[in-house]
């Protein structure tokens, strides 16, 4: 039985489509292609005589159609008006003609989408972020990608407005990364340039790492004290030190050479992040013994945080 196959079935505007004829009869002498579901002289696109290999355009010919000896019809630079049915009539030597109808659907060429955001530098646990994929295109599917992966399942992620809008509720530091949106129809897809979400967070409660030179398990008089403070923060926190409440340097590491019992006291590391408006600190008590029996760092470190 004569059949028509459209390749592809869903065509993007401006592309081309090939209507392929299958199971052509042996005694064929010519073909005629018509726009629509029936044979109608006003809808004739093109006729073809096999013996002379002559193609004759009809009233529905647009100049974009090409007929081939195997009865296939190529339509180039398709428009949405080309959507619909196409009928092939095969003229046989016994004058008992055969007909078959095929169809294809033309979808608009999709624009490259872009992402707008209400806040590309949100503060953790404080701000929500809404990404909007633009423009709005009818009969189009909207998809979102985070760091090249499909959206994770999370109660803090909400899709709305036909998936055009992605909202991150109470943003977390792990939400940072590259966001893309993609628009799809059955014929094509187009993806936006990535937008980077920079989540501001911290500073977390700092930690102090005691490094003693030479390495030892206790603080002996004459040793070098090397206190390193660290706090997770974006942007990096500003560090500062206080010894017994007296401001010291603004470095991450506090170094004191050849400590003595005069260096006993409370050592506080302060961290601040102007972008989040948050501060934190940790206090450690240090005891230095003049003899070989040193208690070292106090076991109980205090930490304070302020918002």
């Amino acid at each position: 039985k004569l059949t028509i196959e459209s390749t592809p079935f869903n065509v993007a505007e401006g592309k081309e489509v090939l209507l392929l004829a299958h199971n052509l009869p042996q005694n064929r002498i010519g073909y005629s292609w018509y726009k629509g579901e029936r044979v109608d002289g006003n809808s004739l696109i093109v006729g073809y005589v096999i013996g002379t290999q002559q193609a004759t355009p009809g009233p529905a010919y647009s100049g974009r159609e090409t007929i081939y000896p195997n009865a296939s019809l190529l339509i180039q630079n398709v428009t949405q008006n080309d959507t619909g049915f196409y009928t092939l009539q095969v003229i046989k030597s016994d004058l008992v003609n055969e007909e078959a109808t095929g169809q294809f659907h033309v979808y608009p060429e999709l624009p490259k989408p872009s992402i707008s955001s209400n806040n590309s530098n949100p503060v953790e646990d404080k701000d929500a972020v809404a990404f909007t994929c633009e423009p709005e295109v009818q009969n189009t599917t909207y998809l979102w990608w985070v760091n090249g992966q499909s959206l994770p399942v999370s109660p803090r992620l909400q899709l709305s407005n036909g998936n055009m809008t992605l909202t991150l509720l109470s943003v977390k530091r792990n939400d940072a990364g590259s966001y893309e949106c993609e628009i799809q129809n059955p014929a094509s897809a187009n993806r936006s340039d990535p937008v980077t979400l920079n989540v501001l967070y911290g500073p977390d409660v700092p930690t102090i790492s005691p490094i003693i030179s030479p390495p030892d398990s206790s603080y002996l008089s004459g040793a070098n004290l090397n206190l390193s403070c660290h706090s997770a923060s974006n942007p990096s926190p500003q560090y500062s030190w206080r010894i017994n409440g007296i401001p010291q340097q603004h470095t991450q590491v506090l170094f004191i050479a050849k400590i003595t019992p005069n260096n006993n006291g409370t050592y506080a590391c302060f961290v601040s992040n102007l972008a989040t408006g948050r501060n934190n600190s940790i206090v450690k008590s240090i005891t230095v013994s003049a003899s070989g029996t040193s208690p070292g760092l106090s076991a109980g470190a205090h930490h304070h945080h302020h918002h």
């Epitope: 530098n121 942007p235 990096s236 926190p237 500003q238 560090y239 500062s240 340097q249 603004h250 470095t251 991450q252 590491v253 170094f255 102007l274 972008a275």
Partner: antibody, heavy 120, light 107 residues
Framework: QVQLVQSGAEVKKPGASVKVSCKAS????????LHWVRQAPGQGLEWIGY????????SYAQKFQGRVTMTRDTSTSTVYMELSSLRSEDTAVYYC?????????????WGQGTLVTVSS | DIQMTQSPSSLSASVGDRVTITCRAS??????LAWYQQKPGKVPKLLIY???NLVEGVPSRFSGSGSGTDFTLTISSLQPEDVATYYC?????????FGQGTKVEIK
């Protein structure tokens, strides 16, 4: 007290290289990052880049990428800034400056400056 | 890169006048902004950091304010020794960028 002492003035031909030194004293050299800033005659301040003397890590302004190299010698508490492929518009006073603290701080102590003149 | 725009480029005021210099950043700086003073033939001197923190030894007639992208340096009562060029600079990560400078003169 904190001091940053730079090497003396240099006159160079276009296409040549210049290496300026900055010797630090009065503080723990490896604890503070050192930046280089230049100032063309009658002009404003332009940041070139910085080096972390502890690790040797460097970061340069895009404009100077490929032409500038910053190094350090912890044994002498000295940092160096070498600028290659000199052109006349590189004529400027080059300053080394210490960052006030670690991470997101400005520059609190500055060297006296080194005048580099590029002329044929 | 972040652009820093200062205004005015120069000003002339009388001793005792209140002087204001503004600095605008092309992006939010979250308060990471510093001011420097450079007297003729001298090296730059840090006056203020974190928008409003006065460096030890800097006279209290200098003050800073602002947030986001707009910042101000104020000299409450201009003194002859304040004749200099003043630069703003953001210090939220590198590359650091400076304003083009404001030259302050005495009438």
């Amino acid at each position: 007290q904190v001091q940053l002492v730079q090497s003396g003035a240099e006159v160079k031909k276009p296409g040549a290289s210049v290496k300026v030194s900055c010797k630090a004293s009065g503080y723990i050299f490896t604890s503070y990052w050192l930046h280089w800033v230049r100032q063309a005659p009658g002009q404003g301040l332009e940041w070139i880049g910085y080096i972390n003397p502890n690790t040797g890590y460097t970061s340069y302004a895009q404009k100077f990428q490929g032409r500038v190299t910053m190094t350090r010698d912890t044994s002498t508490s000295t940092v160096y800034m070498e600028l290659s492929s000199l052109r006349s518009e590189d004529t400027a006073v080059y300053y080394c400056a210490r960052e006030y603290g670690n991470y997101n701080y400005p520059l609190d102590y500055w060297g006296q400056g080194t005048l580099v003149t590029v002329s044929s | 890169d972040i652009q820093m725009t200062q205004s005015p480029s120069s000003l002339s005021a009388s001793v005792g006048d209140r002087v204001t210099i503004t600095c605008r950043a092309s992006e939010n700086q979250y308060g990471y902004l510093a001011w420097y003073q450079q007297k003729p033939g001298k090296v730059p001197k840090l006056l203020i950091y974190n928008t409003k923190n006065l460096v030890e030894g800097v006279p209290s007639r200098f003050s800073g304010s602002g947030s986001g992208t707009d910042f101000t340096l104020t000299i409450s009562s201009l003194q002859p020794e304040d004749v200099a060029t003043y630069y703003c600079q953001h210090h939220l990560g590198t590359p650091y960028t400076f304003g083009q400078g404001t030259k302050v003169e005495i009438k």
